[in-house]
C-alpha cells in the first residue's frame, strides 16, 4: 500500500501545491504559477515547470541563470504561455510585445518579431542529443554497463519508454544520449522526450524537480557518475527559420 495519501505531496514535481480536495478526499496537486492540475504519477510538462519556476519567489530560486554552455537554448528562462494540456503555445511573447515561435521543448526557432508574428503550428522536437562530460574517474566506464544504466535511468526515473532512447555513445570523458520520438510514435500516456530531457538536465545540475531532497544518485557498477558539463541539442521535424543576419553574426 502507499502512504502518499497521508502526506499529500507530488513525488514527481516539488513545484506544486497539494491538498486532499480531489474526488473522495484524494490528494490533488496543482502546479505553481499556472494552477493547473498535474498527474503526479508521471512527469510534469516542461512548460508548466518553467511557468512554476518563474512564479517562485526570487530568493527561493537556485542557479536560475542558464549554463554558459547552453549553446542552443540561449534565450534561457522565460515565463511561457502553456495550452490547456500544459504544452508550449507555438507563439510566445514577453511583456514588451516581442514575440517569437518555439518548438515543443519551448526553445525559440524563429527571429523575434512583434505581435503580428504568426506561428502556425507547434513544431515537434523529434531528436534530442544530450552531450555530457563526466568528471575524471580511476578508469573509463564500461560502455555496455554505462549504456544499460542510462537506459534504465530514463525508463525508471523519468518513465520514458525504452524505444525512445535511440543510442548511448561513449568516448571518455564524453557521453552522448540520443532521444528520438516522432509525432507518429508518441502514444497517449507516453512521456515526451523533451520533458524527460528537462528533468534529466535539472537533475544533473543538482536542481532536482522530484519531491525528495536527496537528488540524483547515479552509479555505474557502484562508481558514481558525476557530470561536469552538459550540452543539449534539439532537432525539430521542420527546420527552424532564422534570418541570414543571425547566422552570420
Amino acid at each position: 500500500h502507499t502512504a502518499a495519501q497521508d502526506n499529500c505531496t507530488c513525488p514527481t514535481n516539488k513545484m506544486t501545491v497539494c491538498s486532499p480536495d480531489g474526488p473522495g478526499g484524494r490528494c490533488q496537486c496543482r502546479a505553481l504559477g499556472s494552477g493547473m492540475a498535474v498527474d503526479c504519477s508521471t512527469l510534469t510538462s516542461k512548460c508548466l515547470l518553467l511557468k512554476a519556476r518563474m512564479s517562485a519567489p526570487k530568493n527561493a530560486r537556485t542557479l536560475v541563470r542558464p549554463s554558459e554552455h547552453a549553446l542552443v537554448d540561449n534565450d534561457g528562462l522565460y515565463d511561457p504561455d502553456c495550452d490547456p494540456e500544459g504544452r508550449f503555445k507555438a507563439r510566445q511573447c514577453n511583456q514588451t510585445s516581442v514575440c517569437w515561435c518555439v518548438n515543443s521543448v519551448g526553445v525559440r526557432r524563429t527571429d523575434k518579431g512583434d505581435l503580428s508574428l504568426r506561428c502556425d503550428e507547434l513544431v515537434r522536437t523529434h531528436h534530442i542529443l544530450i552531450d555530457l562530460r563526466h568528471r575524471p574517474t580511476a578508469g573509463a566506464f564500461n560502455h555496455s554497463d554505462l549504456d544499460a544504466e542510462l537506459r534504465r535511468l530514463f525508463r525508471e526515473r523519468y518513465r520514458l519508454h525504452p524505444k525512445f532512447v535511440a543510442a548511448v555513445h561513449y568516448e571518455q570523458p564524453t557521453i552522448q544520449i540520443e532521444l528520438r520520438q516522432n509525432t507518429s510514435q508518441k502514444a497517449a500516456g507516453d512521456v515526451d522526450i523533451g520533458d524527460a530531457a528537462y528533468y534529466f538536465e535539472r537533475d544533473i545540475k543538482g536542481e532536482s524537480l522530484f519531491q525528495g531532497r536527496g537528488g540524483l544518485d547515479l552509479r555505474v557498477r557502484g562508481e558514481p557518475l558525476q557530470v561536469e558539463r552538459t550540452l543539449i541539442y534539439y532537432l525539430d521535424e521542420i527546420p527552424p527559420k532564422f534570418s541570414m543576419k543571425r547566422l552570420t553574426a
Partner: nanobody, 131 residues
Framework: QVQLQESGGGLVQPGGSLRLSCAAS????????MAWFRQTLGKGLEGVAI????????YYADSVKGRFIISRDNSKNTLYLQMNSLRPEDTAMYYC????????????????????????WGQGTLVTVSS
C-alpha cells in the same frame, strides 16, 4: 505499482537474533533507496535503518547501531534486516519501505520529513522480544 511483503518476525528471547526479509514485486525497487521502520505503542513510528540502491551506504538509528544490519539483494528484489542482541524495547511492528523515485539519494534517517521520501510500505511483521 510497488508492493512489499515482510516476513521473519516472531517471538525471541532477549539477546537473541532474527532476520527479517522484505520481498518486492517490482524490479524497479533495485534502483530505489529502501528502509526499515518500526512502530511501537510507546514511541510511535521510528526509522530503523536505510540503505542506498547500490547497497554501499547504510544509515542506522542510534538505538540499533552495532546490533542491526540492513542489506539487500537486488538480483532477488529483497531487503533484509539482521537483528542481533535483541532487547525488550525492540518489540514492535517492523515495516519495510521503498522510496518514491528511483535513483534518488537516500534521506537522512533523522530527517523529520523522512516519510515523504518513502510512500511505499509493506503490511509489517511483528517482532516480540520477551523472556
Amino acid at each position: 505499482q510497488v508492493q512489499l511483503q515482510e516476513s521473519g518476525g516472531g517471538l525471541v528471547q532477549p539477546g537473541g537474533s532474527l532476520r527479517l526479509s522484505c520481498a518486492a514485486s517490482d524490479y524497479s525497487t533495485g534502483r530505489r533507496c529502501m528502509a526499515w521502520f518500526r512502530q511501537t505503542l510507546g514511541k510511535g513510528l521510528e526509522g530503523v535503518a536505510i540503505i542506498d540502491y547500490a547497497g554501499t551506504s547504510t544509515y542506522y538509528a542510534d538505538s540499533v547501531k552495532g546490533r542491526f544490519i540492513i542489506s539487500r539483494d537486488n538480483s532477488k528484489n529483497t531487503l533484509y534486516l539482521q537483528m542481533n542482541s535483541l532487547r525488550p524495547e525492540d518489540t514492535a511492528m517492523y515495516y519495510c519501505a521503498a522510496a518514491a523515485i528511483p535513483y534518488e539519494r537516500c534521506p537522512d534517517i533523522s530527517d523529520p520529513q523522512i516519510l515523504v521520501s518513502f510512500p511505499y510500505w509493506g503490511q509489517g511483521t511483528l517482532v516480540t522480544v520477551s523472556s
